[in-house]
């Protein structure tokens, strides 16, 4: 297993609709054809997997049908979008990249993106 540098923004504020997008960029040392991207969430010392996708270079990322993540790839960059976020989902989202094929296997883990999510203010009660 060889180490690889992964860069991602430090802080991002999700949209009022609970959507956060960020780029995860990896310094590929070779010509990988198969890449796996995993998003991990760290909060209160717990790390949980948010979503994961394996893709062939030049193809779309395919997450599971019920995944809250979508993404596109371009060269050594992966543009990740996480949807359906609420204030309780605020936390550190870490991008993990694995170059699966061809060998050697490379692993890179970013420093994480602190995603802040603001629940929208409830609408004031209407008289109508």
């Amino acid at each position: 297993c060889k180490a690889m540098h992964v860069a991602q923004p430090a802080v991002v504020l999700a949209s009022s609709r609970g959507i956060a997008s960020f780029v995860c960029e990896y310094a590929s040392p070779g010509k990988a054809t198969e890449v796996r991207v995993t998003v991990l969430r760290q909060a209160d010392s717990q790390v949980t997997e948010v979503c994961a996708a394996t893709y062939m270079m030049g193809n779309e990322l395919t997450f599971l049908d019920d995944s809250i993540c979508t993404g596109t790839s371009s060269g050594n960059q992966v543009n990740l979008t996480i949807q359906g976020l609420r204030a309780m989902d605020t936390g550190l989202y870490i991008c993990k990249v694995e170059l699966m094929y061809p060998p050697p296997y490379y692993l890179g883990i970013g420093n994480g993106t602190q995603i802040y999510v603001i629940d929208p203010e409830p609408c004031p009660d209407s008289d109508f």
Epitope: P9, A10, V11, V12, A14, S15
Partner: antibody
Amino acid sequence: QVQLVQSGAEVKKPGASVKVSCKTSGYTFTSYGITWVRQAPGQGLEWMGWISAYNGNTNYAQKLQGRVTMTTDTSTSTAYMELRSLRSDDTAVYYCAKVSGYFDYWGQGTLVTVSS
Amino acid sequence: EIVLTQSPGTLSLSPGERATLSCRASQSVSSSYLAWYQQKPGQAPRLLIYGASSRATGIPDRFSGSGSGTDFTLTISRLEPEDFAVYYCQQYGRSPFTFGPGTKVDIK
């Protein structure tokens, strides 16, 4: 080294607007946020809101909602805070700070005086 | 919104003494997203501690932070003349990001 340099002191009349700038250097501007904090004379720190320089999304303190607008110019790594309909109790030193979650670097402050 | 309460309001001590400042949150601060700042008259605040216990760059080791959940403490092991200032705690785990009212450490 990281630096945040704010625009100079302003004197405004009640009802007017003020726009304070915060020019940053020494770090990747779009990877972080910029927050604005104010301090009335002899008082504590009041958080006004922040902007994510990565995507331009904003989050304002409820009491200032509708009167404050925070923006960024990524081409010059500069953040702006505009406060409208100024009142005498808006007289304060206004600080910008870099958001890494916590506020790790601060501007020198801009005194805004609201007086008729 | 998370309300932070600091105590005491003023702490009168002599150089060389130990200072213990308290910050209590109205609800749990997630992932210990609590910071401490020092402010001297006419100056901008300066970050001392983040993540409840991590010292910011360039901060001397006489400053230490501890605590989790709703109770946090800033300790200055031996007060130096330059440490007499106002100290604020702040939570950045949930919006709105809130500050405590501050504790003034002055010379006895």
